[in-house]
């Protein structure tokens, strides 16, 4: 293009880029009629007064990804056209005051990223347009009061990724339009009451990844717009009982990776949209009754790595749409027959890692639609008859990793086996505990001649007379098993507007490697 | 090579709404404008909005304005278009759409359209 | 943001050369110079063929040409072929940083 700058490109005749090593200073001439700037990856270490001076008509600038240490006060001037601005990844430590003056059309501001200490009041009072401004990334240690007030069209603020010990409580009061508010990564110990009383849109507020200990009853009280709660990754150890009373719009909350010891029934609702609950790694001990029962809607309730030694037989009340349950790697030792009753979409139950010696003979009796069971590491000698019969789509059994007493009790759960071998999988099959003589040895093939008669009073309802060979033409044929469905492994918490984590951590849902992808 | 996958088509009821995504591939999804355009039943190409995902504000035409929103998740490489108070006429062919450069000033790449049909 | 006007419809012979005009006003066609023009078949996405007013993108056959004059904008298609058949839609930027498209010209290669 005529008019490209030597050491830049031009995709169109209004779009410049400029990258590269070799390039020290803003390139000119630019085109008069440039639309969009970007100087990226250049040893560009400051802007001087105006270097834009000619370029009037600019919508779009990107700085980034510089050595930039350094801009003068006027370096922006005449930018008016400018609805956005990015000077992210670059080695700004200040910002001058009035660096954004006279930008009246800018709507989003993009500081992320370097190494800011501090912001003020005034840095931000020309800007009254601003929709989005992202600071994560910084080295920021306070917002003064006032540094936001004048942005009352602001959508989105990122203070993610900072150092940030406290907020007063007035920062934010004049963000009547705010959507979304990210603190998460920073060094918060409590938020005062009131500090998110102005936020009457904001439908995500991410305080993850902090030290918060306690909250305030009534810290979300105006933000029924609120759909996305992230606070897991803190030192909470009880919730207020009014905390999340008023947020009938949620419908993702974590809480993981805190300190909590109890949940008290109804702490959770009305919820009605809450699809998602994740409460793995706290510090749980027992469920119970109603602890969920506004959550009509929940589908994945993750209470995995806690200390579960009870768990009331109405603790699952109304969770008529739970499809994933998670209870792996407690402290569970016993199970009322009840206690999934109600769970009659419920798909797939993690429940290894556990103390479990017996299941009810009635544990899954309502919960016909389950396809994968995993109840691996657990203290299980045997298992009551008839326990999985009903259980027409299960493809995914798990019993590894249990001290299978293998008696002529055992002959009917071995025999279900034996016809429902692929439903075990192919990484470990349950071996026999006892008696010592055949310990070692696959449940599914034990040898007849060795196992023991048993001379105790079963637990467990006696079963019908089994052959020990059962017809080998009623196996199902191995093809015909449809694998489970692939659970989706859980998103993590945003930690900035690009990026979304995805945890690889297939112990919190308890997957096998060939689930998890 | 630049694609745009676009989701499925849609039947919706009158004052309800739809959210049509853009998977994008082959690319920096970030720092270019992704639009969106529709297309009545014989009618002409009409443009709604488009957004610059590094940015994250859209920008809207003013018929659209207040009644669509438009977002994109950077880390799934997807555009969303969400239309609201849906009414008879807005049954139309929904395309995303991008360019080459930052700022979108003609359309190089498009998806393959969604049909959203708004009936009673 | 009124729709830039062209022709409903056009005609030309196999071999013959037509020309689409799109007429906008000095905030749009006249005011830059980022006009372009979209070929579209039944039941496909649009295809650009032309952009900052005469512009091929690669792969454009050099039977398209554009050009501006005013607030008027133009398309000519030379050495008409049957496959040129499709709807042809002009566009440009605004001065309020968006886009409009014309209402469209049905071609038809008699």
């Known amino acids: 293009y005529y008019g490209c700058p030597s050491e830049c490109t031009c995709s169109r005749a209004s779009q410049v880029e400029c990258t590269g090593a070799r390039i020290v200073a803003v390139p000119t001439p630019l085109p008069w009629n440039a639309m969009s700037l970007q100087i990226l990856n250049t040893h560009i270490t400051e802007l001087s007064e105006s270097p834009f001076l000619n370029i009037s008509a600019l919508i779009a600038l990107r700085i980034e990804k510089n050595e930039l240490s350094h801009i003068m006060p006027g370096a922006f001037r005449n930018l008016g056209s400018l609805r956005y601005l990015s000077l992210a990844n670059n080695k700004l430590q200040v910002l001058p005051i009035g660096l954004f003056q006279g930008l009246d059309s800018l709507e989003s501001l993009l500081l992320s990223s370097n190494q800011l200490v501090q912001i003020q009041p005034a840095h931000f009072s020309q800007c009254s347009n601003l929709k989005e401004l992202q600071l994560h990334g910084n080295h920021l240690e306070y917002i003064p009061d006032g540094a936001f007030d004048h942005l009352v069209g602001l959508t989105k603020l990122n203070l993610g990724k900072n150092s940030l010990t406290h907020i007063s409580p007035r920062v934010f009061q004049h963000l009547g339009n705010l959507q979304v508010l990210r603190l998460y990564e920073n060094r918060l110990t409590d938020i005062p009451m009131g500090t998110f009383d102005g936020l009457v849109n904001l439908q995500e507020l991410a305080l993850q990844q902090n030290q918060i200990g306690l909250l305030s009853p009534g810290l979300f009280h105006n933000n029924h717009n609120l759909q996305r709660l992230y606070l897991s990754n803190n030192h909470i150890s009880q919730l207020p009982p009014s905390i999340f009373m008023q947020l009938p719009q949620l419908n993702r909350l974590t809480l993981f990776g805190n300190s909590l010891k109890e949940l008290s029934p109804g702490i959770f609702g009305p919820m009605p949209n809450l699809r998602e609950l994740w409460l793995y790694d706290n510090h749980i001990t027992s469920l119970p009754d109603n602890v969920f029962s506004n959550l009509r809607q929940l589908q994945v309730l993750i209470l995995s790595r806690n200390q579960i030694s009870f768990i009331s037989p109405g603790a699952f009340n109304g969770l008529t749409e739970l499809r994933e349950l998670s209870l792996h790697t407690n402290a569970l030792q016993d199970l009322d027959g009840n206690v999934f009753r109600m769970l009659a979409n419920l798909q797939n139950i993690s429940l290894q890692n556990n103390r479990l010696r017996q299941l009810p003979g009635n544990i899954f009796a309502n919960v016909n639609g389950l396809m994968t069971i995993q109840l691996q590491n657990n203290q299980l000698e045997n298992l009551p008859l008839g326990i999985f019969d009903h259980l027409g789509k299960l493809c995914e059994l798990r019993l590894y990793d249990n001290p299978w007493r293998c008696d002529s009790d055992i002959l009917p759960l071995r025999n279900w086996l034996l016809l429902n071998q692929p439903r075990l999988g192919t990484d470990t099959v349950p071996v026999c505990f006892s008696p010592a003589n055949v310990r070692g040895q696959s449940l599914i093939i034990i040898n007849v001649n060795v196992a023991v008669p048993s001379v105790h009073v079963p637990e467990v309802p006696s079963y019908p007379e089994t052959s020990w060979y059962p017809d080998t033409s009623s196996y199902p044929d191995t093809t015909s098993i449809s694998s489970t469905t692939e659970l989706t492994s859980p998103v993590e918490d945003y930690t900035d507007l690009t990026t979304i984590q995805v945890t690889d951590d297939r112990s919190v849902w308890g997957m096998t490697q060939a689930q998890s992808g | 090579q630049v694609q745009l996958v676009q989701s499925g088509a849609e039947v919706k009821k009158p004052g309800s709404s739809v959210k049509v995504s853009c998977k994008a591939s082959g690319g920096t999804f970030s720092s270019y404008t992704i639009s969106w355009v529709r297309q009545a039943p014989g009618q002409g190409l009409e443009w709604m909005g488009g957004?610059?995902?590094?940015?994250?504000?859209?920008n809207y035409a003013q018929k659209f304005q207040g009644r669509v929103t438009i977002t994109a998740d950077e880390s799934t490489s997807t555009a969303y278009m969400e239309l609201s108070s849906l009414r008879s006429e807005d049954t139309a062919v929904y395309y995303c759409a991008r360019g080459v450069a930052l700022l979108a000033t003609d359309f190089d790449y498009w998806g393959q359209g969604t049909l959203v049909t708004v009936s009673s | 943001q009124s729709a830039l006007t062209q022709p409903a419809s056009v005609s030309g012979s196999p071999g013959q050369s037509i020309t689409i005009s799109c007429t906008g006003t000095?905030?749009?066609?006249?005011?830059?110079?980022?006009v372009s023009w979209y070929q579209q078949h039944p039941g496909k996405a649009p295809k650009l063929m032309i952009y900052?007013?005469?512009n091929r993108p690669s792969g454009v056959s050099n039977r398209f040409s554009g050009s501006k004059s005013g607030n008027t904008a133009s398309l000519t298609i030379s050495g008409l072929q049957a496959e040129d058949e499709a709807d042809y839609y002009c566009q440009s930027w605004t001065h309020d940083n968006s886009v409009v498209f014309g209402g469209g010209t049905k071609l038809t290669v008699l």
């Open positions: 900052e007013v005469s």
């Open positions: 957004i610059i995902p590094m940015f994250g504000t859209a």
């Open positions: 000095s905030s749009d066609v006249g005011g830059y110079n980022y």
